[in-house]
């Protein structure tokens, strides 16, 4: 607000007023009269820059008149009362209402006093974020999408992530005239390490008290990544049974585990139990390469492990699990 005048009447109003598309807004405008000053106001006038004529007038005897009577209203001026408050309410804000307005007091004996107010027409955007489910491509692809719909002015979208990635942002006109829909894609080379991680879309707009944060859980579809665990190179004859586990990471989840050897089917001492392979005690040395083949919707991958059961007394701390 401008500082009050010294010794002269001064019109007080904010330099800028925000209003929302479709809503109503009040353009505040007051005449401040210093204590010792005397003034008489006979007319209040509102005009829009660049347009001919006044849009609203409050006349001391004729009362209010409007260029669009259904959309404008003096909120405080009344016939028979001192005209000190020229505040004007505008209903059903349109994009084309944005602009500079002059609020003017016709006073005696000071003359006309006016101030300019910028009306900013805003539209609060609706924000959504969604994952773009991808497969391993070896090149950058959109992995998340953030859309701010129907904002005025356009929303600002930024991405926050530890994974790197690059934004690709575009704008198109919104459904309502003068509004803008902003779409931002978060682009990265897909990898299994990214699957299940989060990225955050941050949307900033004049109409928000604070930025909106939308979290996206990334999805990368990839075939199984397979390894076999449970063998410590320290298996001996006479030990109790041990268990090998076929560890598979995949998206979607594995649909099947198949155990075999390089020579073909499993030997009798090895019993498949889904992702696990039970190794029963043996009475002669073994040197066998085991294969775990894991299947999901995207394909099959396998891991190999050469297992040796050696002669010699088993130590207290051998790698075999004892029952």
């Amino acid at each position: 607000w401008p500082p009050p005048g010294t010794g002269d009447v001064v019109v007080q109003a904010p330099t800028q007023v925000p209003g929302f598309l479709g809503d109503s807004v009040t353009l505040p405008c007051y005449l401040q009269v210093p204590n010792m000053e005397v003034t008489h106001v006979s007319q209040l006038t509102w005009a829009r820059h660049g347009e001919s004529g006044s849009m609203a007038v409050f006349h001391q005897t004729q009362g209010p008149s409007y260029s669009e009577s259904k959309r404008l209203e003096f909120v405080a001026a009344r016939l028979g009362a001192e005209l000190r408050n020229a505040s004007l309410r505008m209903f059903g804000l349109r994009v084309e209402d944005e602009g500079n307005y002059t609020c003017l007091f016709v006073t005696f004996p000071q003359g006309s006093r006016s101030v300019d107010i910028w009306l900013r027409v805003l539209a609060k955007p609706q924000n959504t974020a969604e994952v773009q489910k991808v497969q391993l491509t070896g090149e950058p692809v959109p992995m998340a999408r953030c859309v701010s719909t129907g904002g005025r002015p356009p929303a600002q979208i930024t991405w926050h992530s530890d994974l790197g990635g690059m934004p690709n942002t575009s704008q198109v006109p919104g459904f309502l005239s003068g509004t803008v829909t902003v779409t931002s894609l978060w682009i990265l080379v897909p990898s299994s390490q990214v699957d299940g991680k989060n990225v955050t879309c941050k949307v900033e707009h004049e109409s928000f008290e604070k930025p909106q944060l939308l979290t996206v859980n990334l999805t990368v579809y990839y075939p199984p990544e397979v390894s076999i665990s449970g063998y410590d190179n320290n298996w001996y004859l006479g030990q109790n049974e041990a268990t090998l586990t076929c560890d598979a990471r995949s998206n979607p989840e594995p649909t099947g585990y198949n155990w075999s050897t390089t020579m073909g089917p499993l030997p009798p001492f090895a019993v498949a139990q889904g992702a696990q392979l039970l190794i029963r005690p043996v009475d002669k040395p073994i040197n066998t390469t085991l294969i775990c083949n894991v299947t999901n919707a995207l394909g099959a991958r396998q891991a190999e492990l050469t297992v040796q059961v050696k002669e010699g007394p088993p130590s207290e701390h051998s790698g075999i699990s004892r029952n």
Epitope: P109, G111, S112
Partner: antibody
Framework: EVQLVQSGSELKKPGASVKVSCKTS????????MHWVRQPHGKGLEWIGG????????SYNQRFKGRVTITVDKSTSTAYMELSSLRSEDTAVYYC?????????WGQGTLVTVSS | DIQMTQSPSAMSASVGDRVTITCKAS??????VAWYQQKPGQPPKALIY???YRYSGVPDRFSGSGSGTDFTLTISSLQAEDLAEYFC?????????FGQGTKLEIK
């Protein structure tokens, strides 16, 4: 009904003064500023000045500054305009007019003739 | 002082004609312009205030327009009783000033 009734015609010699009255009725006198406008015969209108009855605040046209005095009597809801050091070019019809930014009600006019 | 230049200074028109009188201010006066009608032997009568708003009781054949420096008074369909002189006035700043008048005669 708003009415502004002015005093009658005046014939004055150059150098003299004239005081024209304007008695109002039909509205609250103190709520409106009263102004004076003159019109030489067959010519345009010229604003002289105005007064706010409540405060006594005045504004004058610089052309008349020092020669014109506008006053009011709130008790009788009457405004006065006194013009001194009259000259022949001051010959005109003098109107009081109620001010609403524009002038919405006018008196019937007072002819002031300045002639030797 | 702000000069108000009216044109034409005189004109004649027939009943039913559309009549336009213009007024040009020497500087921006916003919409602080009034129009008056003065019939012979009478004081002026206010027709229009704030450039385009008609006083109650004024026939709607009278209309005003404009802002800034260029203003127009239009009589959409001239009537015999419109024989008069018409004045514009600015009340943007003191001293208030009037146009020199347009004398309208009926043919």
């Amino acid at each position: 009904e708003v009415q502004l009734v002015q005093s009658g015609s005046e014939l004055k010699k150059p150098g003299a003064s004239v005081k024209v009255s304007c008695k109002t009725s039909g509205y609250t006198f103190t709520e409106y500023t009263m102004h004076w406008v003159r019109q030489p015969h067959g010519k345009g209108l010229e604003w002289i000045g105005g007064i706010h009855p409540n405060s006594g605040g005045t504004s004058y046209n610089q052309r008349f500054k020092g020669r014109v005095t506008i006053t009011v009597d709130k008790s009788t809801s009457t405004a006065y305009m006194e013009l001194s050091s009259l000259r022949s070019e001051d010959t005109a019809v003098y109107y009081c007019a109620r001010w609403t930014g524009d002038f919405d009600y006018w008196g019937q006019g007072t002819l002031v003739t300045v002639s030797s | 002082d702000i000069q108000m230049t009216q044109s034409p200074s005189a004109m004649s028109a027939s009943v039913g004609d559309r009549v336009t009188i213009t007024c040009k201010a020497s500087q921006n006066v916003g919409t602080n312009v009034a129009w008056y009608q003065q019939k012979p032997g009478q004081p002026p009568k206010a027709l229009i205030y704030s450039a385009s708003y008609r006083y109650s009781g004024v026939p709607d054949r009278f209309s005003g327009s404009g802002s800034g420096t260029d203003f127009t008074l239009t009589i959409s369909s001239l009537q015999a009783e419109d024989l008069a002189e018409y004045f514009c006035q600015q009340y943007e700043s003191y001293p208030y000033t009037f146009g020199q008048g347009t004398k309208l005669e009926i043919k």
